[in-house]
Structure formats: C-alpha cells, structure tokens
C-alpha cells in the first residue's frame, strides 16, 4: 500500500552564525528552515516522478550555530571569508550517513550572483545526491556528498522567500539527479513566443529566477525525467516511510506538544526535551502553558505573551503581529492595501506580500530593457514596462512614455534582482551581471578532487 | 549638448493665465521630444506634458488636461506652456526636459521658472 512506501527523505539543517545574526533569535531561524522545508515539501509532493508520487521531506536534526559559536573550534562554518565551494566542502567533511540530505544555509553574498551549490545524485555508482554515505575519496578526506548549501544574499541584498526557496528546491533538485534545464521544452522563458515566455522558466533554470512566474515553482519534464531515474534506484537506500513526527528536531509537528531539541540544545524550562522517557518527551512539563518552541508569543516563563504585545515587525506590505493573549502563535498581520509600493518602490504589495512591479500599478507590465545590439546595457537594471502584451512598447520609468505615470524618474532594480531576461542579476553598480552557471564546477576540476567527482556537482 | 533655458513664470492670482517658454539652445531642437515638469515644495517632482518631435502627439498629467497646452516652435527652438484657469495647486517650480526619443529617459533638464498662483 502506499502508506508503507519509503518516500520521505530525512534531512539535517545546519546554519552558520550569519544566517543566525541575520535572523536574530533561534526561534526566527527555527522558523525559516520550517518555511524552507514547507515550500519544498509543497513541490515535490505534488510532482509526479513518472509514477512515484508523494515524496516528503522532514527534518531529522537542526544545528543552530550563534554568534557565540563564531569563535568556536569545532565549528566548521565560523571563517568570515569562504567562498561558495570551500562552504560546501566543510559542510561535506562531516559524515552526514544518517541522513538522506544535509544543508548548510547561510547569509553570505557568493561571487558571481551563486544562490547554492550542491551535489548531483545519479541512478548508478557513487557521485553524490541522496542517500550517498560518507567515504574516502582521493584527495585522501572522507567527505558525505549527499550535501548542498545556500545563502539568502545576492550582491548586498536579501532574496524574496519565494525565490530562496525555489533555491532551496533547485539545490535539493541537483541532489535528486537532476541538471540544468536546458533545451526550448524545458526554457520556455527563453522562448521568442510571448505566450511561452510569460510562464518563465522551471525550477532548474539555469540563470535567475524571480519567484512568481507560474512556471518557477514546477519541475519540468527534463527534471521529472532525471529525477525519476535517480528516485528509482536511491530511494530505498535510504527514505522512509512518512507519518511520525521526529522529537528532537525543533519543529513542532502533529502529535507533539512542543520541541525544544535534545539535551544540549534544549534551553527550554517548559517542555521535555527529546533525550527524556517515550510518554514525556516533547510535552509540556506540568502546569506549564506554553513553550517558546510553539510560537513567538510564548514567554521564557511557559505563559502565553499578553493580548498587546508584538510578535512580527510591520512590513512593507503587512502590519505588525500582534499576540492575542491566548495562544503561542503569532496571528496573522493585517495586509497593507494592494498597490502600496514596496521593496524601494520597485514593487507593489498584493494581497499581504511584496509581489507585484510598480509597473502593475499603472495597468502595465514589467518587461526587460534590453536592446537586440546590446547598446542600451545601462538600462538593463532599470524598472521597464511595456503595455499588456506589448514588447514594442518596453521602455524605462524614466522614459519620456511613462512620464505621466513616473515623472521622468529612473527607477532602479535592487542589487541581486534577476536581469536582462532572467540571464543575471543587478549588483550594487546597477551592472547586470550574467550568471556563469557551472564557475564553481570548473574551479572545482582545477582543486584537489579526482577527476569523476567534477561531473556531479551544479548550482 | 542642449541647454535649456525657462521664463515666463511669477505671481499670479487664482483664474489667471501665464505662458512659460523654454528656449533650446543647438541645432538639433527638432529631433528632441520636449516635456514640462514641476515640484511643489517639500512634493516630488511631477509631470505636467510633453510633445513629440513634430508637434502632432502631446500627453497631458490628468490634473491639467483641458487647462494647459504645451506646442512648439522648431524654427525657434523653442517649447511653450500655456497655462489658463491657475489654481493655488499650480504653484510650483515649473522646468523643461528633453529627450531623445520616446524611450529614452530625460536627459537634459533647464534650471526652471518659479510659478506662484495665490488665492
């Protein structure tokens, strides 16, 4: 039957000290690997992999490393300066064998525009991806390569959630055996037919992606098929079958009360860490309300956080949480009105969420300032928009066009915001830098590993 | 290089009329479209109309359509505004651009003429 099925590939999320001062507070970054692993599962649950169905993730173990950990010996990940291949070596140095995939996520602007890498799993010999136990290989390290790591920084700036996690599906796709997408089936982005274009590129694009294209959460056909391939071979090695919550993990699951981790990561005074006896463990301990593992709104004390007090910071498009006073969970926030600009006025809030270009709020559309001969470079990281369906009609806020709508103002796109098609991003010189794919590949073939390790490592 | 000077602005009461003119100095007046923008204090720059290279297209901001008229003399290299029915919300420094094409961003701005409509 299906629910005796091994389809749920285990994970363990590790975070350096950058993503934490970033985030703040453990129970922030808790929140964002959950949101991670959320968006993810959401994809691959409801892709079909040429007949396998259903696949889930769900973490198995968290390591949070502080600022306090910065200093710490035995933390791999406390060095300021690291480039994106070294990241993904240290974090492959550990032996990650009881894990289907382990991540790093990090704060840290990569050169060149990098999101991620990580390693590409294969139906057959070892090379990496899911379920890949720790060994020796010939630069004479053991090394786990069923690891991937990503940053939520792009030239100085911070990634939309949406877009770190198709990030995060796309590193996690490369683990699954699947490549670039490459080809005019699985490009449609690239395509020169408006109405291909419009739906973006898949999740294993090689180049950039914006995140609200009704394509750039979805597999295409080429992933599905590589995917299924590796799925068949690897997943009995090491998934299991889904259902019970993991106690330890820090993520409050169904059938658990709270989690605050295991022994040494509980600093918790109400609830029952992971290490404690079957009918206590993760449960709050007696006459306690809450625990701060539940939700923002509980206080250190095990009671809820009164009825005024705030639990989410207002933000461009929504307005400050508030607690009720009755629950550990910080309510939803009240949208800010739809077309209120957002994200330095490049965008406008719809529903609650930066997701809209400012050119939605005069009937237009976004669309790429470039020029066939290449001329207009300089334009290739302004806001441009075109009436609906108009690419003739593409031209720059700042332009003459659009005066009544902009007053004559150049509108700038933010660094680490997806340029001239989707091909780069903006730095802080408003350049449109183009993304080398496979840079991190090739300085790896120049480093120490034997050389069939190249062929199974992407961003 | 196009220099663009403006004049014609001052105090006027509300219901008067004022003709603000912007001369170009250069050969190549023609092959510019000409815009007028202005700035209220402590306000953002705003549009008010721009003309393309002939003459033959003009876009007005909503705010002043059916009270101002933008035209121009490409034999005199210059673009005017005729502004009629002034309310106190006109007040404003009024300055003209110029542009190459109608694409292209504004690349060149005059110093701008300081326009004052009291009740």
């Known amino acids: 039957t299906t629910s005796a099925e091994k389809n749920t590939c285990q994970l363990y999320i590790q975070t350096d000290h950058l993503f934490f001062k970033y985030y703040g507070t453990r129970e922030a970054v808790i929140a964002q690997i959950s949101s991670h692993v959320k968006a993810i599962d959401t994809i691959y649950q409801t892709t079909d992999f040429s007949g396998i169905r259903n696949i889930s993730f769900m973490v198995k173990r968290i390591r949070i490393n502080t600022t306090a950990d910065e200093k710490d010996p035995t933390n791999p990940f406390r060095f300021p300066n690291i480039g994106v291949e070294k990241f993904l070596e240290l974090n492959s140095e550990q032996n990650h064998d009881d894990y289907c995939l382990a991540y790093v996520f990090t704060d840290r602007d990569f050169d060149d525009g990098v999101l991620g890498l990580a390693w590409v799993g294969a139906p057959s010999g070892s090379s990496g991806g899911i379920c890949e136990k720790s060994k020796l290989y010939s630069d004479g390290k053991k090394k786990s390569l069923n690891t991937g790591i990503i940053t939520v920084q792009n030239y100085g700036s911070h990634v939309p959630p949406k877009v770190s996690h198709i990030t995060f599906a796309h590193e996690v796709g490369h683990n699954f055996g699947s490549p670039h997408d490459s080809g005019t089936e699985c490009t449609p982005g690239e395509s020169k037919n408006l109405g291909q274009k419009e739906n973006g590129n898949y999740i294993m694009y090689a180049r950039a992606t914006s995140g609200d294209k009704l394509n750039n959460n979805k597999f295409s056909l080429c992933s599905i098929r590589n995917i299924s391939q590796v799925l068949e071979k690897k997943r009995n090695n090491c998934f299991v079958e889904s259902g019970q919550p993991i106690c330890g993990n820090g993520m409050v699951e169904q059938g658990e009360e709270c989690d605050c981790g295991y022994s040494d990561q509980c600093k918790d005074e109400c609830c029952f860490d992971a290490n404690q006896p079957e009918g206590r463990k993760c449960k709050l301990k007696p006459g306690k309300q809450c625990s701060p593992s539940q939700g923002p709104c509980c206080t250190a004390q095990c009671a809820f956080k009164s009825k005024s007090e705030k639990c989410r910071d207002d933000s461009d498009c929504a307005r400050e949480g508030i607690c009720n006073g009755f629950t550990a969970l910080c309510p939803a926030s009240d949208p800010k009105p739809n077309f209120t600009d957002c994200n330095r006025h490049t965008q406008v809030c719809i529903n609650g969420q930066c997701a809209g270009s400012i050119c939605e709020k005069y009937g237009l559309e976004e669309c790429t300032c470039a020029s066939s001969d290449g001329k207009d470079d300089k334009e290739l990281c302004h806001v441009c928009c075109m009436k609906k369906m108009d690419p003739s009609t593409c031209a720059s806020t700042g332009s003459v066009q659009w005066s009544r709508h902009f007053s004559g103002r150049t509108i700038t796109l933010q660094p680490g915001s997806p340029c001239n098609d989707f091909r780069g991003y903006c730095d802080v010189f408003m350049r449109c830098r183009l993304v080398d794919a496979d840079g991190p590949l090739a300085r790896l073939k120049k480093a120490i590993f034997s050389p069939e390790l190249y062929e199974n490592i992407a961003e | 290089e196009v220099q663009l000077v403006e004049s014609g602005g001052g105090l006027v009461q509300a219901g008067d009329s004022l003709r603000l003119s912007c001369a170009a100095s250069?050969?190549?007046?023609?092959?510019?479209?000409m815009g007028w923008f202005r700035q209220a204090p402590g306000k953002e720059r705003e549009f008010v109309a721009h003309i393309s290279l002939s003459g033959g297209n003009t876009e007005y901001a909503d705010s002043v359509k059916g009270r101002f008229t933008i035209t121009r003399d490409n034999a005199g290299n210059t673009v005017y505004l005729q502004m009629n029915s002034l309310k106190p919300e006109d007040t404003g420094v009024y300055c003209c651009?110029?542009?190459?094409?109608?694409?292209?961003?504004?690349?060149?701005w005059g110093q701008g003429t300081q326009v004052t409509v009291s009740s």
């Open positions: 250069g050969r190549t007046f023609s092959s510019y479209y």
């Open positions: 651009a110029a542009s190459p094409s109608l694409r292209s961003a504004w690349q060149y």
